[in-house]
């Protein structure tokens, strides 16, 4: 049985303020069952950019339908970035429980905002 | 075709125990969640117990007497269920999770189910 | 736990003619809900899946609406096979999967 991995594939993305980000994840199992959320930064002080659960997330869209079946595409969209979105956004699967714990965080990659071109 | 074949029912006595088992076919057993849901006689649908890879989850109500199990090489799910009770009569079917990308699981394809009678 | 509220419990219709019935959770479950179709003595079958998304092979007349807390199945042009169970099921909070009670639809 193959064991999960979450591949996160860009260690860097450059966006100019006011843009999108695409932040992309993807994993290789639907095992262990549960949910994926994007984080950014980590430990304690780490914020929640999404899930399905809490929001709304006006900025953030997922780049494959919510809908799909058997989905393994967990890509997410930022829209108006600012120099305030700047950091290391990590893509982490939860093992469903009471509550759900986490089970394995992507490589992380590390979002960098230029400045808006004049 | 996807299918799914409940076996293993039968009449049992109060305290008893009984082993269902549900072979599956059409598809890559291995990848999918499965689910056994019952129905008592002339009564709605609950949910019993799930089983991904090595996590199970189970009801309330069968906590602690049942198990629910799988056996990958020989695609057949599993529920072992014990200290049974009047109150487990009922139709066991076994279902194929399907995963809904950001959200959780419903069933796709079912069994035709098999009878479990508790009795004295 | 989240309880799924099914009504009318029993609906009487002509064949030809629509049928709509409800399903009410009682917290918020967004889209996560599916529909089933119970004939007797048969297994139950998926119909809808995210409220409103038909299963492959489906119908058209069946369709599914609404979201949050309130749900709605309709079948447009009852047949003769469509006189069955229907449930609903919330696959938002688990454990555990929860079952509405059921909606019977019998001919009038």
């Known amino acids: 049985e193959e064991e999960l991995q979450i591949i996160q594939p860009d260690k860097s993305v450059s966006v100019a303020a006011g843009e999108s980000a695409i932040l992309h994840c993807t994993i290789t199992s639907l095992f262990p069952v549960g949910p994926i959320q994007w984080f950014r930064g980590a430990g304690p002080a780490r914020v929640l950019i999404y899930n399905q659960r809490q929001g709304p997330f006006p900025r953030v869209t997922t780049v494959s339908e919510t809908t799909k079946r058997e989905n393994m595409d967990f890509s997410i969209s930022i829209s108006n970035i600012t120099p305030a979105d700047a950091g290391t956004y990590y893509c982490i699967k939860f093992r469903k429980g009471s509550p759900d714990t986490e089970f394995k965080s992507g490589a992380g990659t590390e979002l960098s905002v230029r400045a808006k071109p004049s | 075709d996807v299918q799914l074949l409940e076996s293993g029912g039968g009449v049992v006595q109060p305290g008893g125990s009984l082993r269902l088992s549900c072979a599956a076919s059409?598809?890559?057993?291995?990848?999918?969640?499965m689910t056994w849901v019952r129905q008592a006689p002339g009564e709605g649908l609950e949910w019993v117990s799930t089983i991904g890879s090595g996590d199970t989850y189970y009801a309330d109500s069968v906590k602690g007497r049942f198990t629910i199990s799988r056996d990958n090489s020989k695609n057949t799910l599993y529920l072992q269920m014990n200290s049974l009770r009047a109150e487990d009569t009922a139709v066991y079917y076994c279902?194929?999770?399907?995963?809904?990308?950001?959200?959780?699981?419903?069933?796709?394809?079912w069994g035709l189910g098999t009878l479990v009678t508790v009795s004295s | 736990e989240i309880v799924l509220t099914q009504s009318p419990a029993t609906l009487s219709v002509s064949p030809g003619e629509r049928a709509t019935f409800s399903c009410r959770a009682s917290q918020n479950v967004k889209n996560d809900l599916a529909w089933y179709q119970q004939r007797p003595g048969q297994a139950p079958r998926l119909l809808i899946y995210?409220?409103?998304i038909r299963e492959t092979g489906i119908p058209e007349r069946f369709s599914g609406s609404g979201s949050g807390t309130e749900f709605t199945l309709t079948i447009t042009s009852l047949q003769s096979e469509d006189f069955a169970v229907y449930y609903c099921?919330?696959?938002?909070?688990?454990?555990?999967?929860?079952f509405g009670g059921g909606t019977k639809v019998e001919i009038k």
């Open positions: 995210a409220a409103r």
């Open positions: 059409g598809f890559s057993f291995s990848n999918f969640a």
């Open positions: 099921q919330q696959y938002y909070d688990w454990p555990p999967f929860t």
């Open positions: 279902a194929k999770d399907s995963t809904v990308s950001w959200s959780g699981d419903f069933f796709d394809y």
